[in-house]
């Protein structure tokens, strides 16, 4: 008789999830000499231990603490780039500007990027059929709690000038419900962080509006200012040119506004 299985609204665990996590871990530790000491079997065991045999709507940050401990990594605290709803460009930027880091450039972020996972209460099985959706099912699911945990720690580590890339094509350029808006903004440490600098990325070819005047950006400025952190904002009118100029800053066309 097939065992009754909870049907969730979200997609199931990414296929070959254990193999993918292990392979990514080995690859990361090979590329980053400072993380060579990391034991990927132990990382996978700790990752698995955070959600296996647990109800996928009852996951806590505490469940991920063994993984956080094993994945402890020091990134230059003044070289942190946060992003919201514009992941691809943020990652393209840090691939060029190698001394800056998004969360996905760290071991734990790299391991989990674009993956979904969940288990089932009281069984050691991974659920490849469905996983809880944050809105339709529950917020304390394995994926959401993981990103909340690593995002909080990443923001807490930041210092000096912190940059955030925001998507100017969205109706809410700054969204209070995004991970950036709900977690990272509130965990920047005023005693360490002097300024949050927002880069608003324009989507339209001929879009010359000053999106730094957008009401949601003003809302972000207000939240940040109340936390005793300075705020600044820049329009990135031409993201393609912006990336090109990061690659080749000496290019004569890079002195004009981008």
């Amino acid at each position: 008789v097939p065992r009754w299985r909870q049907q969730w609204s979200g997609p199931g665990t990414t296929k070959r999830f254990p193999e993918t996590v292990l392979a990514r871990c080995v690859k990361y530790t090979e590329i980053h000499p400072e993380m060579r000491h990391v034991d990927c079997q132990s990382v996978w065991d700790a990752f698995k231990g955070a959600f296996i045999s647990k109800h996928p709507c009852n996951i806590t940050e505490e469940d991920y603490q063994p993984l956080m401990k094993l994945g402890t990594q020091t990134v230059p605290c003044n070289k942190i780039l946060l992003w919201s709803r514009i992941k691809d460009l943020a990652h393209q930027f840090t691939q060029v500007q190698r001394d800056m880091f998004t969360l996905e450039d760290t071991l734990l972020g790299y391991l989990a990027d674009d993956l979904t996972w969940c288990g089932e209460f009281n069984t050691s099985k991974i659920n490849y059929q469905s996983c809880p959706d944050w809105r339709k099912d529950c917020s304390n699911n394995p994926v959401s709690v993981f990103w909340k945990t690593v995002s909080r720690r990443f923001a807490e580590a930041a210092c000096d000038v912190v940059h955030v890339m925001l998507n100017g094509s969205r109706s809410k350029i700054f969204d209070k419900n995004s991970t950036f808006g709900s977690v990272e903004v509130h965990n920047l440490q005023p005693e360490k962080v002097q300024t949050l600098e927002a880069w608003v990325i324009h989507g339209g070819r001929e879009d010359s509006r000053d999106l730094c005047q957008d009401p949601t950006i003003k809302e972000l400025e207000s939240i940040i200012s109340k936390r005793n952190i300075q705020f600044s904002c820049k329009n990135i009118y031409r993201p393609d040119k912006f990336l090109q100029c990061v690659k080749n800053p000496e290019d004569s066309s890079c002195t004009s506004e981008i």
Epitope: P18, E19, A23, V26, E30, H37, V38, D39, C40, Q41, S42, D45, A46, G49, P66, L70
Partner: antibody
Amino acid sequence: EVQLVESGGGLVQPGRSLRLSCAASGFTFSSYAMSWVRQAPGKGLEWVAVISYDGSNKYYADSVKGRFTISRDNSKNTLYLQMNSLRAEDTAVYYCAHLRFGYGMDVWGQGTTVTVSS
Amino acid sequence: QTVVTQEPSLTVSPGGTVTLTCASSTGAVTSDHYPCWFQQKPGHPPRALVYSTDTIHSWTPARFSGSLLGGKAALTVSGVQPEDEADYYCLLYYGGARVFGGGTQLTVLG
């Protein structure tokens, strides 16, 4: 310097028990999976067991399953192998190895000899 | 019981090239088995040479290389030296458990 030192080997009669220890130093023992590997006289290497960094996951070779138990005490930086119901074919040099996933066993002890004979 | 098979013995002349292979009874060896290779000389514990299929350890001479070859893991020694005479073992990963190959005794002539 990373070092592993096995102890506890010796001559034991079939059916009896023995506990091997492996003292680790020079690395963060509590962050690594650890393994036992054995080598019978004149024979090849045989993987025996592995234990996760925190002791929660253990895997055994079929030949020792149900008779051997791998354990660890992270506060003492020590790995153990409890061997029960010993047989003549368990006679071997037992090595403790520092295991990094994907990197294989990059540090080995010198081994301790177990002889099972009446 | 998974069995990992290696050539029992191989002979090579100094300066020659030799390839040792490692096959799995469960099917083709892939990168998911994270093949590792070890060298062992009489009276000594094994020494890791190659990990993750094709990456050599910092202490491994450049004449050693790892690869996947026709569904098997392979260790190639190019420009064999007399000191390469030893037993060689592969190790495969099976989702927690590991299995060593039976070993290859490499003899360097002369």
